[in-house]
């Protein structure tokens, strides 16, 4: 596959991944109440996200509300907010870096420097995927740990929400897309990080006697 095709495919995957990450960040479905206790008088589902939580009553009536205060949130939600937003912003920066290094743009003159810019964009997307993966896995670990913790009351047990799965899919796309962008940059000029301009010196003129300098012979 040509480097341009790798570049386009990589960028498309990264853009879809970025969109997925924004969706995961905004959705109030990072954790969803687990139905384990059939004795609960009124069945209701609680969804919790990074910015708000929603309650769906048995009647189907749903109410969502943004959290009252950042302080009222647990440390892991605060950390997840910070890391996810950082990943979204980093992906935005990576987009401009990738476009600047793309073969179809003229922001940077074609050559090794342009390939290095494209490679940087790919690496940024890879890092962006890893950055987003941290809160997703940390959050999932807490939810699963509390689910199996016998000291946690049944009414407080949660299951993994749809936003986590969307987030994981998004990080996979960002990382695969980042790898493809790196590969595209690599193929483009052949190891752009190693391609430095080589200086060739002109052959030396013969001396007055017509002899060549001994240093010119190996």
């Amino acid at each position: 596959m040509g480097s341009a095709a790798l570049e386009i495919l990589g960028l498309v995957l990264c853009l879809v991944g970025w969109g997925g990450l924004i969706l995961a960040c905004g959705l109030p479905m990072w954790q969803v109440t687990a139905f384990l206790d059939h004795n609960i008088v009124t069945a209701q589902t609680t969804w919790k996200g990074l910015w708000m939580s929603c309650v769906v009553q048995s009647t189907g009536h749903m109410q969502c509300k943004v959290y009252d205060s950042v302080l009222a949130l647990s440390t892991e939600v605060q950390a997840a907010r910070a890391l996810t937003v950082s990943a979204v912003l980093l992906a935005f920066v990576a987009l401009f870096v990738t476009l600047a290094g793309a073969q179809c743009t003229t922001c940077v003159a074609p050559g090794p420097a342009k390939a290095r810019v494209a490679l940087t964009g790919g690496v940024l997307y890879l890092f962006c995927g890893l950055l987003a993966l941290v809160p997703l896995c940390w959050f999932a670990n807490i939810v699963v740990r509390e689910f199996y913790d016998p000291s946690v009351p049944v009414s407080q047990k949660y299951e993994l929400g749809a936003a986590l799965y969307i987030g994981w899919a998004a990080t996979a796309l960002l990382m695969v897309g980042g790898c493809l962008l790196c590969c595209g940059a690599w193929v483009c000029t052949g190891r752009p990080d190693l391609s430095f301009p080589v200086k060739y010196s002109a052959p030396r003129r013969p001396t007055a006697t017509g002899d060549y300098d001994k240093k010119n012979y190996v």
């Epitope: 919790k48 509300k65 009252d68 205060s69 009222a72 949130l73 647990s74 440390t75 939600v77 946690v152």
Partner: antibody, heavy 117, light 107 residues
Framework: QVQLKQSGPGLVQPSQSLSITCTVS????????VHWVRQSPGKGLEWLGV???????DYNGAFKSRLSISKDNSKSQVFFKMNSLQADDTAIYYC????????????WGTGTSVTVS | DIVMTQSHKFMSTSVGDRVSITCKAS??????VAWYQQKPGQSPTLLIY???TRHTGVPDRFTGSGSGTDYTLTISSVQAEDLALYYC?????????FGAGTKLELR
């Protein structure tokens, strides 16, 4: 089961300080905040302050100068201290878990009846 | 501070009746209102938050409604165990403030 058990003196001398310990079970102080509310016949329910899961504290301005709330996550304990008590501080003092993300005390402790005399 | 006013200190009712307890905030609290029930010698228990969302395990005969400054707790069919003190609370801003309470008693 979510529980908040309180321990503290029933009788306090005027101008002395009040210390109450709230020991929680069924949830972690790393994940939930703990509110302090008092109830007196004259003034009804009064919110005093909250110790958030992250460690920061919010106080009711009317009590800020003489109130201190701290916690020990490892021991699942929250400590309440109020200085310079007067007769009108006679009340039942409650600790209550905060609803995750909101200024709503959802599960209340047993309460500590305090008489200033 | 936001003042929460419960106009009725006492409300008389009979088992099976529908009863509504009202609460008025001194300013718009945009549905950030909670309702508590307190039985004699017990701690308050949360019934409703966000003005209309029932807390886990609360029977569906308890419903909350309202917006802006006016809020209502309705018990569709009063049971003997519902005879208690009811408090409203705003969770719009700190300091959190409570109403003076409404005591529900048998007629």
């Amino acid at each position: 089961q979510v529980q908040l058990k309180q321990s503290g003196p029933g009788l306090v001398q005027p101008s002395q300080s009040l210390s109450i310990t709230c020991t929680v079970s069924g949830f972690s102080l790393i994940r939930y905040g703990v509110h302090w509310v008092r109830q007196s016949p004259g003034k009804g329910l009064e919110w005093l302050g909250v110790k958030w899961s992250g460690g920061s504290t919010d106080y009711n301005g009317a009590f800020k100068s003489r109130l201190s709330i701290s916690k020990d996550n490892s021991k699942s304990q929250v400590f309440f201290k109020m200085n310079s008590l007067q007769a009108d501080d006679t009340a039942i003092y409650y600790c209550a878990r905060g609803l995750d993300g909101y200024y709503v005390p959802d599960v209340w402790g047993t309460g500590t009846s305090v008489t200033v005399s | 501070d936001i003042v929460m006013t419960q106009s009725h200190k006492f409300m008389s009712t009979s088992v099976g009746d529908r009863v509504s307890i009202t609460c008025k905030a001194s300013q718009d609290v945009s549905t950030n209102v909670a309702w508590y029930q307190q039985k004699p010698g017990q701690s308050p228990t949360l019934l409703i938050y966000w003005a209309s969302t029932r807390h886990t395990g609360v029977p569906d005969r308890f419903t909350g409604s309202g917006s802006g400054t006016d809020y209502t707790l309705t018990i569709s069919s009063v049971q003997a165990e519902d005879l208690a003190l009811y408090y409203c609370q705003q969770h719009y801003s700190t300091p959190l403030t409570f109403g003076a309470g409404t005591k529900l008693e048998l007629r």
